[in-house]
């Protein structure tokens, strides 16, 4: 494979976060080459001496893959020709967090870029009215978080109000002994108001909104990854 080693090509990565137990993507793009057989993709992880993944001559070459990644990686083979070297990581583990290098060799030269990959657990919260309680109460539940997040309540009517005195948050360890279920209860809820339950750790921020009126209940949730352009 004859490259001079003197020319450099542009390689671009994007910091991202992986949700433990689910599949994740490590994003990497590069200046494409005309021939697939001339492209080599190598994914490396800081402190790991074996390769995370290697793709060359149009197919995966996994003989040098490190044990901790065996059977868990794949590139998007049909997109390599257009400059996509992104890596799919199956069943994300807490220990997958770290700095990765996307290293590319083509007939034009070689290049690399690093990316920070965070791992944790994050999930959408669901806010419901707790009809079993003695007073009007809201219950915010999110099934999987790690590391332990903070939970803050807010309301549209009482903007800036501190609800810590009238709320109670608990964290229950899930069966796999890493992630936790988050349950937060807000008391003394008034009608015709929109309440927000905001759950946040250093990886993600999720919000569950509930609007309670005489005639209906409206819910909305959204989740945003932090320190990530993904």
């Amino acid at each position: 494979f004859g490259i001079s080693g003197r020319h450099s090509i542009t390689v671009t990565t994007v910091a991202s976060a992986g949700n433990i137990g689910e599949d994740g993507i490590l994003s990497c793009t590069f200046e494409p080459d005309i021939k697939l057989s001339d492209i080599v993709i190598q994914w490396l992880k800081e402190g790991v001496l074996g390769l995370v993944h290697e793709f060359k001559e149009g197919k995966d070459e996994l003989s040098e893959q490190d044990e901790m990644f065996r059977g868990r990686t794949a590139v998007f083979a049909d997109q390599v020709i257009v400059g996509n070297a992104s890596l799919r990581l199956k069943n994300v583990q807490l220990t997958d967090a770290g700095t990765y290098k996307c290293y590319i060799i083509t007939s034009k030269g070689k290049g690399n870029a690093n990316l920070e990959y965070k791992t944790g657990a994050f999930s959408m919260p669901e806010v419901n009215v707790d009809y079993n309680a003695s007073s009007e109460t809201l219950r915010c539940e999110a099934p999987r978080w790690f590391p332990q997040p903070t939970v803050v309540w807010a309301s549209q009517v009482d903007q800036g109000a501190n609800f810590s005195e009238v709320s109670n948050t608990s964290f229950e360890l899930n069966s796999e002994n890493v992630t936790m279920k988050v349950v937060s209860v807000l008391y003394n809820v008034t009608i015709n108001n929109t309440y927000s339950c905001m759950i946040e750790n250093d990886i993600a921020k999720a919000t569950g909104d509930i609007k309670v009126t005489e005639s209906e209940i409206k819910r909305r949730s959204h989740l945003q990854l932090l320190n990530s352009k993904a």
């Epitope: 800081e46 402190g47 790991v48 001496l49 074996g50 901790m68 070689k110």
Partner: antibody, heavy 121, light 107 residues
């Protein structure tokens, strides 16, 4: 100053054990993979073992697999090589070395002075 | 395992000579190759990494080239302190392997 200092070598009988230590100073120990390399008298260099920065991954040459164990104590900035079931062919100067760069694709840029292990009855 | 074959095993040269040492890998290692210098009773010293990158503090008379399976270490003008044994080493695949060494002696 970046430095590695090995100790623990000596004379041991075949079948015996030794533990080599390598004290690191002058750099952030837990961000570098570390290696043990040996050199038998009058011979070339032979890679023996390596450990990742976190200590979570270890690697061995076939000639020592199952007999040698590499480990690191980040709190003490020290690398270890536990050598069991020693053989005459393990006689060598043992060097610890730091991996240059963060990803394993470069060479070993800092070496200790070496410690001598002699296996003989 | 990847075999690293170095040649020649020894050579005699004079101060000021241009010296070339070659290293061949049994299969492609891209540019995952380092060159070391070792003097008697001393630890090896890193000269070149990534096949062609000069390690900090190493004189510019040393240079490395090659990729894939064939690599070269060149000393453009041999100096008295350069008489030593030189080793190549691949870090593409564990077990990492060294070449057998090339002893550069005074003619």
């Amino acid at each position: 100053e970046v430095q590695l200092l090995e100790s623990g070598g000596g004379l041991v009988q075949p079948g015996g054990s030794l533990r080599l230590s390598c004290a690191a100073s002058g750099f952030t120990f837990n961000t570098h993979a570390m290696h043990w390399v040996r050199q038998a008298p009058g011979k070339g260099l032979e890679w023996v073992s390596a450990i990742s920065g976190s200590g979570g991954s270890t690697y061995y040459a076939d000639s020592v697999k199952g007999r040698f164990t590499i480990s690191r104590d980040i709190s003490k900035n020290t690398l270890y090589l536990q050598m069991n079931s020693l053989r005459a062919e393990d006689t060598a100067v043992y060097y610890c070395a730091r991996l240059l760069g963060r990803f394993g694709e470069y060479g070993m840029d800092v070496w200790g002075q070496g410690t001598t292990v002699t296996v003989s009855s | 395992d990847i075999q690293m074959t170095q040649s020649p095993s020894s050579l005699s040269a004079s101060v000021g000579d241009r010296v070339t040492i070659t290293c061949r890998a049994s299969r492609s290692i891209y540019t995952w190759l380092a060159w070391y210098q070792q003097k008697p009773g001393k630890a090896p010293k890193l000269l070149i990494y990534d096949a062609s990158t000069l390690q900090s503090g190493v004189p510019s008379r040393f240079s490395g080239s090659g990729s894939g399976t064939d690599f070269t270490l060149t000393i453009s003008s041999l100096q008295p302190e350069d008489f030593a044994t030189y080793y190549c080493q691949q870090s593409y695949s564990t077990p990492y392997t060294f070449g057998g060494g090339t002893k550069v002696e005074i003619k």
